[in-house]
C-alpha cells in the first residue's frame, strides 16, 4: 500500500539535488583556493542533516548551524553587493567586478542558488514531488530558512559602504517583504556599515525619471536613517552601458551619467 504523502503547494526538490550540491561544492572549492580545505562530503552531510527527517514546516536557523560552520568564509566586508529582484544583473556585475561579492558568490549561496529542497517528517527520504510554498503553506520551510540564515549572516558581515542593486521596473522598487527588505536591511551593523548606497536599475530605454525619489526608496531611506546608517542613491539609467563601463572604465563615454 503506498504511504500517504503530504501535498505541498510549491515545486518539489530539484532533481538530482544531492549530486548537484556535491558537484557545485567541488567546483567552488577548486576555483577558490581559500576554500580548498573544505570537505564537500561533510558539507553535503551537514546540508542534508538540516532538513532530512524533519517536518518541512518546522525548520529553524539552528538546523543549519552545522552547515554554516563548515561553510565559514571570510569575504572582504567592504566589497559586498546586495540585490533585490534583479539577481541576473547583480551576478553579471560581480563576474566583471571580481573584487565584489553577492551572497551567491560565496560557497553557501553558490551551493543553493536556484535550488529547491525539502524532506519529510520521520523518513530519510527527500521529497521530489512538492515542497512548502512560503505564502500558501508555511514560512519555516527548508529553503526559506536557509536563505534567511545565510542572508542575515551576509548582512551582519558587511562594513564600510554596502551597495544594493534594486529593480526600478517593479511597482515596489524597495519591497519590505523581500529578503533584502525583511532580513538584510535590519541586520546591517550600524557600527560597521557607514553607508548603504542603492543603485536603482532602470528598465526602459527612454526612462529618465529620478527613481531615487520613488516613495519606496524614501521608505528605505527612512529605515536606514533610523538605524544611524547613511544613505545614498544612484539611478542606473542604462544597465547595459553600466556593465560595459565596469568592463572598460577608461572608455570616453563612461564619464557621463549611466
Amino acid at each position: 500500500v503506498p504511504r500517504w504523502r503530504q501535498q505541498w503547494s510549491g515545486p518539489g526538490t530539484t532533481k538530482r539535488f544531492p549530486e548537484t550540491v556535491l558537484a557545485r561544492c567541488v567546483k567552488y572549492t577548486e576555483i577558490h583556493p581559500e576554500m580548498r580545505h573544505v570537505d564537500c562530503q561533510s558539507v553535503w552531510d551537514a546540508f542534508k542533516g538540516a532538513f532530512i527527517s524533519k517536518h518541512p514546516c518546522n525548520i529553524t536557523e539552528e538546523d543549519y548551524q552545522p552547515l554554516m560552520k563548515l561553510g565559514t568564509q571570510t569575504v572582504p566586508c567592504n566589497k559586498i553587493l546586495l540585490w533585490s529582484r534583479i539577481k541576473d544583473l547583480a551576478h553579471q556585475f560581480t563576474q566583471v567586478q571580481r573584487d565584489m561579492f553577492t551572497l551567491e558568490d560565496t560557497l553557501l549561496g553558490y551551493l543553493a542558488d536556484d535550488l529547491t529542497w525539502c524532506g519529510e517528517f520521520n523518513t530519510s527520504k527527500i521529497n521530489y514531488q512538492s515542497c512548502p510554498d512560503w505564502r500558501k503553506d508555511c514560512s519555516n520551510n527548508p529553503v526559506s530558512v536557509f536563505w534567511k540564515t545565510v542572508s542575515r549572516r551576509f548582512a551582519e558581515a558587511a562594513c564600510d559602504v554596502v551597495h544594493v542593486m534594486l529593480n526600478g521596473s517593479r511597482s515596489k522598487i524597495f519591497d519590505k517583504n523581500s529578503t533584502f527588505g525583511s532580513v538584510e536591511v535590519h541586520n546591517l551593523q550600524p557600527e560597521k556599515v557607514q553607508t548603504l548606497e542603492a543603485w536603482v536599475i532602470h528598465g526602459g530605454r527612454e526612462d529618465s525619471r529620478d527613481l531615487c525619489q520613488d516613495p519606496t526608496i524614501k521608505e528605505l531611506e527612512s529605515i536606514i536613517s533610523k538605524r544611524n546608517i547613511q544613505f545614498s542613491c544612484k539611478n542606473i539609467y542604462r544597465p547595459d552601458k553600466f556593465l560595459q563601463c565596469v568592463k572598460n572604465p577608461e572608455d570616453s563615454s563612461c564619464t557621463s551619467e549611466i
Epitope: 572582504p76 566586508c77 558581515a157 562594513c159 564600510d160 557600527e191 553607508t195 548606497e197 547613511q230
Partner: antibody, heavy 116, light 111 residues
C-alpha cells in the same frame, strides 16, 4: 582629491566657548560620517564621537557628553565641534576624521588652548 | 569599552632592522573573519596617518615595508626594514564596538 580643512588655532579663557570647523572637499559630504578625535599635549588619541552627515544625528562618547556638541552645515560641506564652559583640561589638538571606522582622511588639527 | 594595550611603550631600532609592535584588545574585535583593528603613524605636529586597516590591509600609498597581522585579540604591526624617517608614534585603534578606542601609543626611534 579628498581634503578636510580645519579652522585655525584658538586661545580661550576658562568658561568661554569655541567652535571648530572642518570643511570637506573631494567627495560627497553626506556619504560619510565625520568623527572628532582629541589629542592633549604629549598624550595619545581619544575618540570623541561622530556625526551622521546624512541625518545630522550625533553620537557622543560618554566621556564627552554634556559640553561637546557636533553639528553640520551640509550646504557648505562643513562639520563643527562646539565646546562650551571651557576648562584648562580641554587644551588639546582637535581633529576631524572621515568615516568608516578606520580613518584614512584627517583634518590638519585645530589647537584649542584654554588659559586665564 | 574595549581596552587596547600596546607594547612596548618605546623601542629603538637600527636602520635595516625589523620593528615589531603588538596590540592586545580586552576582547575580540573580529566579525565574520574580518578584524576591526587599524594602525596609524603620527609624526610631531602632524595628524595620524593610516597605515593598515582591518588588521592586514595596506592603505594605498603606504610602503610595503609596513605590514599587519593578527586576529581576535592579538595584533602586530611590523616595519621591515626600518628606515630613518619611520621615527614616529604608532597607534592601534579598534572600530569593532563603540566607543572606538586607541592604544596608548608606541614611540619608535631610529638608532
Amino acid at each position: 582629491q579628498i581634503q578636510l580643512v580645519q579652522s585655525g588655532s584658538e586661545l580661550k579663557k576658562p568658561g568661554a566657548s569655541v567652535k571648530v570647523s572642518c570643511k570637506a572637499s573631494g567627495y560627497t559630504f553626506t556619504n560619510y560620517g565625520m568623527n572628532w578625535v582629541r589629542q592633549a599635549p604629549g598624550q595619545g588619541l581619544e575618540w570623541m564621537g561622530w556625526i551622521n552627515t546624512y541625518t545630522g544625528e550625533p553620537t557622543v562618547a560618554d566621556d564627552f557628553k554634556g559640553r561637546f556638541v557636533f553639528s553640520l552645515d551640509t550646504s557648505v560641506s562643513t562639520a563643527y565641534l562646539q565646546i562650551s564652559s571651557l576648562k584648562a583640561e580641554d587644551t588639546a589638538v582637535y581633529y576631524c576624521a572621515r568615516n568608516p571606522g578606520w580613518f584614512a582622511y584627517w583634518g590638519q588639527g585645530t589647537l584649542v588652548t584654554v588659559s586665564s | 569599552d574595549i581596552v587596547l594595550t600596546q607594547s612596548p611603550a618605546s623601542l629603538a631600532v637600527s636602520p635595516g632592522q625589523r620593528a615589531t609592535i603588538t596590540c592586545r584588545a580586552s576582547e575580540s574585535v573580529d566579525n565574520y573573519g574580518n578584524s576591526f583593528m587599524h594602525w596609524y603613524q603620527q609624526k610631531p605636529g602632524q595628524p595620524p596617518k593610516l597605515l593598515i586597516y582591518r588588521a592586514s590591509n595596506l592603505e594605498s600609498g603606504v610602503p610595503a615595508r609596513f605590514s599587519g597581522s593578527g586576529s581576535g585579540t592579538d595584533f602586530t604591526l611590523t616595519i621591515n626594514p626600518v628606515e630613518a624617517n619611520d621615527t614616529a608614534n604608532y597607534y592601534c585603534q579598534q572600530s569593532h564596538e563603540a566607543p572606538w578606542t586607541f592604544g596608548q601609543g608606541t614611540k619608535v626611534e631610529i638608532k
